[in-house]
């Protein structure tokens, strides 16, 4: 896995976008898309050192 | 750990065609954007293009008609071509991945230096 | 396409200093959803640029806090608290906001003095 963002601060939670839950925004076709289609991080096995926990919120960023 | 790798000829005499080979380890082509970046002597950074989740492509309007980018999902590898080369297209190639959640360059290749001259 | 530009070019800096660079956009970072999606990244010698700050303030795992990013609109900065040997290289900043393409500083090389 990739390493991930250091530390995900509530500041840095995204604007309202109008994807659903399972989707993220594409910035580059400017649409939603399902989130495994962009390379997002990804949770890391249970015992690997990992980037603080995504809020439900960060799948539309 | 994702890993890329560039390969291809370091020479290239000039109006012939510049071809680069960015395989990609630890992580699958057939999700998020793969990219090609160049760097010239003295530091400028140039975005080429590249070739999305999907197929698509996008190719940087500064290189006209010249450049193609495809891929080989069976060997998990994207390739650039630029037509016509000439010795302003000296430089270090780079491929990189995109992170899809902040839209930095995660994870870049070694970089290949590829000298235009006859 | 945005233009990024980076002040200064070179920054000769004794270690233990604290050095700083400036990145100007051509338009306003900030994307409709909120982001500002600005980044700096370092090119040591011989190496592949590494990024160091995303989303203007944000550092990446493994970056020492001795390295902070601010701005906001178009007016961004890079501070290194206090230089050491393994700082020096080229920084870049670059936009992810106005894209494709993405576009690149011209890079600012830390030097010793």
């Known amino acids: 896995m990739r390493r991930g963002p250091r530390s995900l601060r509530g500041r840095d939670a995204p604007a309202p976008t109008p994807c659903v839950p399972a989707e993220c925004f594409d910035l580059l076709v400017r649409a939603c898309v399902a989130c495994g289609l962009l390379r997002t991080p990804r949770p890391k096995p249970a015992g690997a050192s990992s980037p603080a926990p995504r809020t439900a919120l960060q799948p539309q960023e | 750990d994702v890993q890329l790798q560039e390969s291809g000829p370091s020479l290239v005499k000039p109006s012939q065609t510049l071809s680069l080979t960015c395989s990609v380890t630890?992580?699958?082509?057939?999700?998020?954007?793969w990219n090609w970046i160049r760097k010239f002597p003295g530091n400028k950074l140039e975005y080429m293009g590249y070739i999305s989740y999907s197929g698509s492509t996008y190719y940087n309007p500064s290189l006209k008609s010249r450049i193609s980018i495809t891929r080989d999902t069976s060997k998990n590898q994207f390739y650039l071509q630029l037509l016509s080369v000439t010795t302003e297209d000296t430089a270090t190639y780079y491929c990189?991945?995109?992170?899809?959640?902040?839209?930095?360059?995660?994870?870049w290749g070694a970089g290949t230096l590829v000298t235009v001259s006859s | 396409d945005i233009v990024m530009t980076q002040t200064p070019l070179s920054l000769p800096v004794s270690l233990g200093d604290q050095a700083s660079i400036s990145c100007r956009s051509s338009?306003?970072?900030?994307?409709?959803?909120?982001?500002?999606?600005l980044h700096w990244y370092l090119q040591k010698p011989g190496q592949s640029p590494k990024l160091l700050i995303y989303?203007?303030?944000n550092r990446f795992s493994g970056v020492p806090d001795r390295f902070s990013g601010s701005g906001s609109g178009t007016d961004f900065t890079l501070k290194i608290s206090r230089v050491e040997a393994e700082d020096l290289g080229v920084y870049f900043c670059s936009q992810s906001t106005h894209v494709p393409p993405f576009t690149f500083g011209s890079g600012t090389k830390l030097e010793i003095k």
């Open positions: 338009q306003s970072l900030v994307h409709s959803n909120g982001n500002t999606y």
């Open positions: 990189a991945g995109l992170d899809g959640l902040y839209w930095y360059f995660d994870v």
């Open positions: 630890g992580d699958s082509i057939t999700s998020g954007y």
């Open positions: 989303k203007v303030s």
